[in-house]
C-alpha cells in the first residue's frame, strides 16, 4: 500500500484550526489479522530523506499521538493529554488519517509527517510515511481561512510506497 498526502501545503491564519490529512492508497487489508499503528510528528526537509527526523508536535511525541486499530475499525485519540494541547488525531474506515490542530500560532509552522505501520499477523509488517507543510501567517497578508494546495502527482516526496 501507499500513503498519499492530498495537500502538500496548508496556509492558515493565526488562531484558526487546521486538519492535516494522509490517505492510505492501494490494497489495504481490512481483515481481523491486520493492525495499523499511525502517528504524526514534526520534521525537517533533509537533503536525502524527508521525515527522518522526529520532533514533537506541541511537546507531544509521536508515541503520545499514536493510534492503533484493527483493519476493520476506526479510531481517534481521546486521551486528555492531546486535547489539552489542542490536538486530536483520527482515522476512518476509508483510509483517511488526520491530525487536527486548534488555535494555531506562528510556532506551529513547519513540516509535518504521518507514519503508518501495517502489521499483518503471522506474515509481515510494512511502514510508510507522508509529508506536508504548514505555514501559519499573521498580519494583513494572512488569509482569512486556511488555504490548501494539492500535491502534484509527480511529487514523490509526498508519497512513499511499501
Amino acid at each position: 500500500f501507499k500513503v498519499a498526502t492530498p495537500y502538500s501545503l496548508y496556509v492558515c491564519p493565526e488562531g484558526q484550526n487546521v486538519t492535516l490529512t494522509c490517505r492510505l492508497l492501494g490494497p489495504v487489508d481490512k481483515g481481523h489479522d491486520v493492525t495499523f499503528y499511525k502517528t504524526w510528528y514534526r520534521s525537517s526537509r533533509g537533503e536525502v530523506q524527508t521525515c527522518s527526523e522526529r520532533r514533537p508536535i506541541r511537546n507531544l511525541t509521536f508515541q503520545d499521538l499514536h493510534l492503533h486499530h484493527g483493519g476493520h475499525q476506526a479510531a481517534n485519540t481521546s486521551h486528555d493529554l492531546a486535547q489539552r494541547h489542542g490536538l486530536e488525531s483520527a482515522s476512518d474506515h476509508h483510509g483517511n488519517f488526520s491530525i487536527t490542530m486548534r488555535n494555531l500560532t506562528l510556532l506551529d509552522s513547519g513540516l509535518y509527517c504521518c507514519l503508518v505501520v501495517e502489521i499483518r499477523h503471522h506474515h509481515s509488517e510494512h511502514r510508510v510515511h507522508g509529508a506536508m507543510e504548514l505555514q501559519v501567517q499573521t498580519g494583513k497578508d494572512a488569509p482569512s481561512n486556511c488555504v490548501v494546495y494539492p500535491s502534484s502527482s509527480q511529487d514523490s516526496e509526498n508519497i512513499t510506497a511499501a
Epitope: 502517528t39 530523506q49 521525515c51 509488517e125 510494512h126
Partner: antibody, heavy 120, light 106 residues
Framework: QLQLQESGPGLVKPSETLSLTCIVS??????????WGWIRQPPGKGLEWIGS???????HYNPSLKSRVTIPVDTSKNQFSLKLSSVTAADSAVYYC????????????WGQGTLVTVSS | DIQMTQSPSSLSASVGDRVTITCQAS??????LTWYQQKPGNAPKLLIY???NLETGVPSRFSGSGSGTDFTFTINSLQPEDVATYFC????????FGGGTKVEIK
C-alpha cells in the same frame, strides 16, 4: 527502567527442543506498542532474528526457522518464551530476548544474552 | 526477505581517524535502518535509527546517512572505547541484520 532477563538450560541435546524464557521487569509486556522478540548469535558470527510476539499473542517468525519455532507469551507472569525444536549443533548460539518499539522500529532494549550449546 | 550486505567485514584504524561502514539493502527500505554497537560479551546497543537519528545519550561523533538501498555509518574521530562490532538492521519489513563490521585500533 525496563529490564529483560533470559533463563534456561545452557546445554541441549541434538534433536531435542530448546526452551528459553525472558522475564520482563520495569514495564508491562501487555503494552500495545511493542514487539517482544528473540535474536541469536552463533559464536563469532552475526545476529539472526528468530521471531517476535505482539502483545495480543500474534507472531512473526523468521521464514528460515518458522517450522521449528514457537514464541508463547504469559502476560500474567510478564514473560515470553522461545521453543526451538529439533535442534542441531548449528543452533548453538548466544540467545537474546529484546523489545522492539513498533513506531520507532529498532530493538531498543535487550537482555544480556544466554549461551546455549547443542551437544550430546 | 530483505538481505542486508555490510562492508567491510573488519577494519583497523588509528585513534582520531574517520571510520566509514556501508550497508546495502536488497530492495528499497526508505530510511528504515538502524545501527547497533556490540562490545565483546555484551548485547548490542542501539546507536542510530531511521538511518540518521542519534539515540539519546549516544556521542555525536557517531552519525548515519542514506536512503533507499545505500546507507553509511560514520565514526568521525575514532576513540579507544569504540572498538566493537557494528551491525545494521532494516525494519521496513520483518527484521534482518547485516553481517557486522569489526572495528579495531591500529
Amino acid at each position: 527502567q525496563l529490564q529483560l532477563q533470559e533463563s534456561g538450560p545452557g546445554l541441549v541435546k541434538p534433536s531435542e527442543t530448546l526452551s528459553l524464557t525472558c522475564i520482563v521487569s520495569g514495564g508491562s509486556i501487555s503494552s500495545s506498542g511493542y514487539y517482544w522478540g528473540w535474536i541469536r548469535q552463533p559464536p563469532g558470527k552475526g545476529l539472526e532474528w528468530i521471531g517476535s510476539i505482539f502483545y495480543s499473542g500474534n507472531t512473526h517468525y523468521n521464514p528460515s526457522l518458522k517450522s521449528r519455532v514457537t514464541i508463547p507469551v504469559d502476560t500474567s507472569k510478564n514473560q515470553f518464551s522461545l521453543k526451538l525444536s529439533s535442534v542441531t549443533a548449528a543452533d548453538s548460539a548466544v540467545y537474546y530476548c529484546a523489545r522492539r518499539d513498533i513506531l520507532t522500529g529498532p530493538f531498543d532494549y535487550w537482555g544480556q544474552g544466554t549461551l546455549v550449546t547443542v551437544s550430546s | 526477505d530483505i538481505q542486508m550486505t555490510q562492508s567491510p567485514s573488519s577494519l583497523s584504524a588509528s585513534v582520531g581517524d574517520r571510520v566509514t561502514i556501508t550497508c546495502q539493502a536488497s530492495q528499497d527500505i526508505t530510511n528504515y535502518l538502524t545501527w547497533y554497537q556490540q562490545k565483546p560479551g555484551n548485547a548490542p546497543k542501539l546507536l542510530i535509527y531511521d538511518a540518521s537519528n542519534l539515540e539519546t545519550g549516544v556521542p555525536s561523533r557517531f552519525s548515519g546517512s542514506g536512503s533507499g538501498t545505500d546507507f553509511t555509518f560514520t565514526i568521525n574521530s575514532l576513540q579507544p572505547e569504540d572498538v566493537a562490532t557494528y551491525f545494521c538492521q532494516q525494519y521496513d519489513n520483518l527484521p534482518t541484520f547485516g553481517g557486522g563490521t569489526k572495528v579495531e585500533i591500529k
